[in-house]
Interface confidence: low
């Protein structure tokens, strides 16, 4: 640090005083010097280092009429809102010719009520879930002892005896307030009061109960919610994108979820109006009077392929001797999936039912066994997808073929004398 030489007498006739106060105090340090000739610039030092950005003002008063006469120079350093960083030893410094002069030191000190560097913050926590709160304070004077309070009740017998900077709370079952007191020799400061809101725990075990082509039934296990009963749970569903739907290198904006509310209990919900055979993602959160839980992770689910919703249409069955010609058209009702084929069942009055898988053809010729005396033969047809058979048509009686009736060429299907499948007639 610069030091004054003793070759000449110090020009300083007034040195900085001392300031001690609490944070936020405004004060002024002052030094005065008398010099001959042109007045020098006065610099301020703190702990030996020049203050480059000091809030200082310099006043110069001539004592004579000639420039070479003496001048009185006064420099004032203003300290606004005293902080810990302002404390230390202050001196004035001037350069006169080839010599450097420094004033006697003055001291700035900080002393008052404790000052909070960190205070507990409002937050939400799940019921019965551990968490930590923070509080930090300083003087001077030191030491500073902390006392935590929960709902205005001290958590220790005296300051400094309980948890200090960090308070570990093993869990809450009701919304509570927390604050901390900071104690030092000057007195007590109280922190802000933090409200810790107790929310329900995240639901668990979200799973599918049943699936249908256009609806899903899901269930879950609720988490603990403290003293606050759950009011409802909210389920969200979105179409899964499977990485598809990307164009120009950018994915589509996410679909806004379909949101449904479920009364509780039961912790179960049916979600309808969905696409058949389509992947979705679902999640659930539950709400009490204090607010909602966090969402579960997205659960991938998929609606199944459905069975056709109606039977084949326009079934006709005609007989010509030992052959029966049956044809039909695709169901008019939605197939709810990929049509894999048709099943046909026929039965005579006194014969067991015969069940056949026709594939995707819409016509078949049956070669009737025996002497052709099978009576009251009826035929039913159903369409099927991978999900199973759709509804069977009403039984259609076999009509005798009349000359002139159109008879398309069909592939013959010879049935074995013993039916491959036997099925109780409905």
């Amino acid at each position: 640090a610069p030091r004054g030489t003793q070759a000449e007498e110090s020009p300083f006739v007034g040195n900085p005083g001392n300031i001690t106060g609490a944070r936020g105090l405004t004060g002024t340090l002052r030094c005065q010097l008398q010099v001959q000739g042109e007045p020098p610039e006065v610099h301020w030092l703190r702990d030996g280092q020049i203050l480059e950005l000091a809030d200082s003002t310099q006043t110069q008063v001539p004592l004579g009429e000639d420039e070479q006469d003496d001048w009185i120079v006064v420099s004032q350093l203003r300290i606004t809102s005293l902080q810990l960083s302002d404390t230390g030893q202050y001196q004035c410094l001037v350069f006169l010719g080839h010599q450097t002069f420094v004033s006697q030191p003055g001291y700035v000190g900080l002393e008052g009520l404790p000052y909070f560097l960190e205070e507990p913050e409002d937050r939400t926590v799940a019921a019965n879930t551990p968490f930590n709160l923070s509080c930090q304070a300083q003087g001077p004077p030191e030491p500073v002892d902390l006392l935590w309070l929960q709902d205005a009740v001290p958590l220790a017998t005296a300051p400094g005896h309980g948890p200090q900077r960090s308070l570990h709370v093993p869990g809450l079952n009701k919304t509570s307030s927390f604050s901390c007191e900071a104690h030092n020799a000057k007195g007590v400061t109280t922190s802000r009061t933090a409200t810790i809101t107790v929310l329900p725990q995240q639901p668990r075990n979200l799973h599918l109960v049943s699936r249908q082509p256009t609806e899903l039934e899901v269930a879950w296990t609720p988490g603990l919610s403290g003293i606050y009963p759950l009011t409802h749970c909210t389920l969200q569903a979105v179409l899964s994108d499977d990485g598809m739907g990307i164009q120009a290198g950018e994915p589509d904006p996410p679909e806004e979820p379909l949101t449904s509310q479920a009364s509780v209990p039961p912790h179960q919900l049916r979600l309808g109006s969905l696409h058949p055979h389509t992947p979705y993602h679902i999640r659930v959160a539950c709400t009490s009077s204090q607010g909602p839980s966090s969402w579960t992770h997205w659960l991938p689910v998929e609606t199944p392929e459905g069975v056709p919703l109606g039977p084949p249409e326009n079934i006709s069955a005609t007989r010509n001797g030992s052959q029966a010609f049956v044809h039909w058209q695709e169901p008019r009702a939605p197939l709810q999936g990929t049509l894999l084929g048709y099943r046909l069942a026929y039965q005579g009055q006194d014969t067991p039912e015969v069940l056949m898988d026709i594939g995707l053809r819409q016509e078949v010729t049956l070669e009737l066994q025996g002497d052709g005396s099978v009576s009251n033969l009826t035929v039913c047809v159903a369409a099927y997808t991978a999900a199973g058979d759709g509804p069977w048509s009403l039984p259609v009686p076999l009509e005798a073929w009349r000359p002139g009736q159109a008879q398309p060429v069909h592939q013959l299907v010879k049935e074995p004398s013993t039916p491959a499948f036997s099925w109780p007639w409905w």
């Epitope: 598809m244 739907g245 589509d252 679909e255 806004e256 379909l258 109006s273 969905l274 696409h275």
Partner: antibody
Framework: EVQLLDSGGGLVQPGGSLRLSCAAS????????MSWVRQAPGKGLEWVSA????????YYADSVKGRFTISRDNSKNTLYLQMNSLRAADTAVYYC??????????????WGQGALVTVSS | EIVLTQSPGTLSLSPGERATLSCRAS???????LAWYQQKPGQAPRLLIY???SRATGIPDRFSGSGSGTDFTLTISRLEPEDFAVYYC?????????FGQGTKLEIK
Amino acid sequence: EVQLLDSGGGLVQPGGSLRLSCAASGFTFSSYAMSWVRQAPGKGLEWVSAISIGGGNAYYADSVKGRFTISRDNSKNTLYLQMNSLRAADTAVYYCAKPGFIMVRGPLDYWGQGALVTVSS
Amino acid sequence: EIVLTQSPGTLSLSPGERATLSCRASQSVSNSYLAWYQQKPGQAPRLLIYGASSRATGIPDRFSGSGSGTDFTLTISRLEPEDFAVYYCQQYGSSPYTFGQGTKLEIK
């Protein structure tokens, strides 16, 4: 019975604005995304815009992006299309349409009767 | 955006004949989210097929859809007089949800 009633069409000068409305009935409006589709005279169908069930996500054709705004009021069962900076190329019949499923990505199974918008000086 | 190209532009057939309409996408259509619509003069479009192959409620079984990826087909097995109209395909798998330019099916 599902019904979509389009209104608000008319004649407007280039650079002008118009707001179309679509009043929905016969289904739970708030459970379905909704779309606008337009058809210029003698031309094909052009998808214009769609909005998700709660109104949080909107989707637009490039030709109207930045000029048209789709919105909905679920309490009034009404869909809107605010059209600003209109051009002659926007002249068309505008149809409000409902998808068959809950999401924006759905086939349009019910359509309004259409509202004619003519942009001309 | 996905561009849908329909062919032919115009198809001239007689009642009772089979009609085959094509729709080709410039890139793969997500989850086969492709629909077919019929439109008659002065009327709003009517949904025929969704999900590339599922018939909408109340649509006669002479209408069928097929295809996946980028190539889709609408088939009308036996044309009835009321089937002569304009047919549009639309993809709804990726925004913007584009339409084809249409195929006009007219009586020969």
